[in-house]
């Protein structure tokens, strides 16, 4: 079996997680992609997904999660903005390929969000401009419910430095709504 590795991201409340998940563009460019959270002993839960088929560079926002799929580059960008301590946990990027089980991209993300608001952008940002243009139009999220039981694993032991994931649900507003963010020319 493939060894599942984790990449740890330590950020403060209010910062932005910005993850780039690479994929083979010839195989998966138009495939539907998703951002999932994995809780100990549970099935991965889909928090946000791209459209089906996935649209090139067309942002999809679900609450505080923004997905951008760049077909030309074979890259899915995932951002979680205005992070909260409750967002701490284990996440993964996947590609839906029914009837086969989802294909996991990248390392799993061990997100640790700590108190202590930072007025600056996330630790991996130095933007001189960071404006999100979000129009008021929304549509229902259409993420497949299908998840293979084989993707359920016992979560690897956490290092002592990790903050454990709270039992409460992640507080993502309007999870059932996707905000279509057009690219402004």
């Amino acid at each position: 079996a493939t060894k599942l590795t984790e990449e740890k991201y330590e950020l403060k409340e209010g910062q932005t997680l910005d993850v780039k998940c690479d994929y083979t563009l010839e195989k998966f460019a138009s495939s539907q992609k998703a951002w999932q959270i994995i809780r100990d002993g549970e099935m991965p839960k889909t928090l946000a997904c791209t459209e089906r088929p996935s649209k090139n560079s067309h942002p999809v926002q679900v609450g505080r999660i923004i997905l951008e799929d760049y077909h030309d580059h074979g890259l899915l960008r995932v951002r979680m903005v205005n992070l909260q301590v409750e967002d701490s946990g284990l996440y993964q990027c996947v590609i839906y390929q029914p009837p086969k089980e989802p294909h996991m991209l990248f390392d799993r993300i061990r997100l640790v969000v700590t108190k202590g608001f930072s007025g600056t952008p996330g630790s991996n940002e130095n933007s001189t401009q960071n404006v999100y243009k979000i129009p008021p139009t929304t549509t229902k999220a259409l993420c497949p419910l299908y998840t293979s039981p084989r993707t359920v694993t016992q979560a690897p032991p956490k290092s002592t430095a990790d903050v454990s994931t709270p039992d409460s649900e992640i507080n993502l507003t309007n999870v059932t709504d996707i905000i279509r963010v057009p690219v402004f020319n």
Epitope: E7, L75, F106, S127, T128
Partner: antibody
């Protein structure tokens, strides 16, 4: 076929200004992040700046912040780099590249020489 | 800033032989690593992204591996057109940074 053609390079005195331009064709310009990468003579590659499709996100390397401005005109499929307060260490070939994080396509570059 | 260090600076290899290049990051870049080839007088060309995914049209003799801080780029059997300078680049964090390059020359 993707084509990126840079222009605007040349010789300029320290403290002077130059505006580089890049004409893009062969791909959907308005759907792509674009960047500038430079290479000093005989040296390695250095990322300079990146801009999102709609200009809503812009990133610069620290050494050019406040002096260089990246911009784009999606209607004209063009990318620009306004360079002010130029220094000798800005001397390099400047490449226009497609992509905001990694760089799939490169122009042939335009040489900027900062010297008195 | 994430510092990328490539080794060796120069690698002398005979045609047909294997070439192995190394790239080390000062902190983890996950799999957000690319490799480029630059021939004399030409612009660079993307070969590998995501540490191990070959870019479109890149021959199978080029491969990449690694994750975190240690990465390897391999040319399984060097062809005459492969003698060039190779750069690694991380894109996990801004600012984006390149390694200093490895020159692969004919032995």
């Amino acid at each position: 076929e993707v084509q990126l053609v840079e222009s605007g390079g040349g010789l300029v005195q320290p403290g002077g200004s130059l505006r580089l331009s890049c004409a893009a064709s062969g791909f959907t310009f308005s759907s792509n992040w674009m960047s500038w990468v430079r290479q000093a003579p005989g040296k390695g590659l250095d990322w300079v700046a990146s801009i999102k499709q709609d200009g809503s996100e812009i990133y610069y390397v620290d050494s050019v912040k406040g002096r260089f401005t990246i911009s784009r005109d999606n209607a004209k499929n063009s990318l620009h780099l306004q360079m002010n307060s130029l220094r000798a260490e800005d001397t390099a070939v400047y490449y226009c590249v497609r992509g905001g994080w990694r760089f799939e396509s490169w122009g042939q570059g335009t040489l900027v020489t900062v010297s008195s | 800033e994430i510092v990328m260090t490539q080794s060796p600076a120069t690698l002398s290899v005979s045609p047909g032989e294997r070439a192995t290049l190394s790239c080390r990051a000062s902190q983890s870049v996950s799999s957000n690593l690319a490799w480029y080839q630059q021939k004399s007088g030409q612009a660079p060309r993307l070969l590998i992204y995501g540490a191990s995914i070959r870019a479109t049209g890149i021959p199978a003799r080029f491969s990449g591996s690694g994750s975190g801080t240690e990465f390897t780029f391999t040319i399984s059997s060097l062809q005459s057109e492969d003698f060039a300078v190779y750069y690694c680049q991380q894109y996990k964090n801004w600012p984006l940074t390149f390694g200093g390059g490895t020159k692969v020359e004919i032995k």
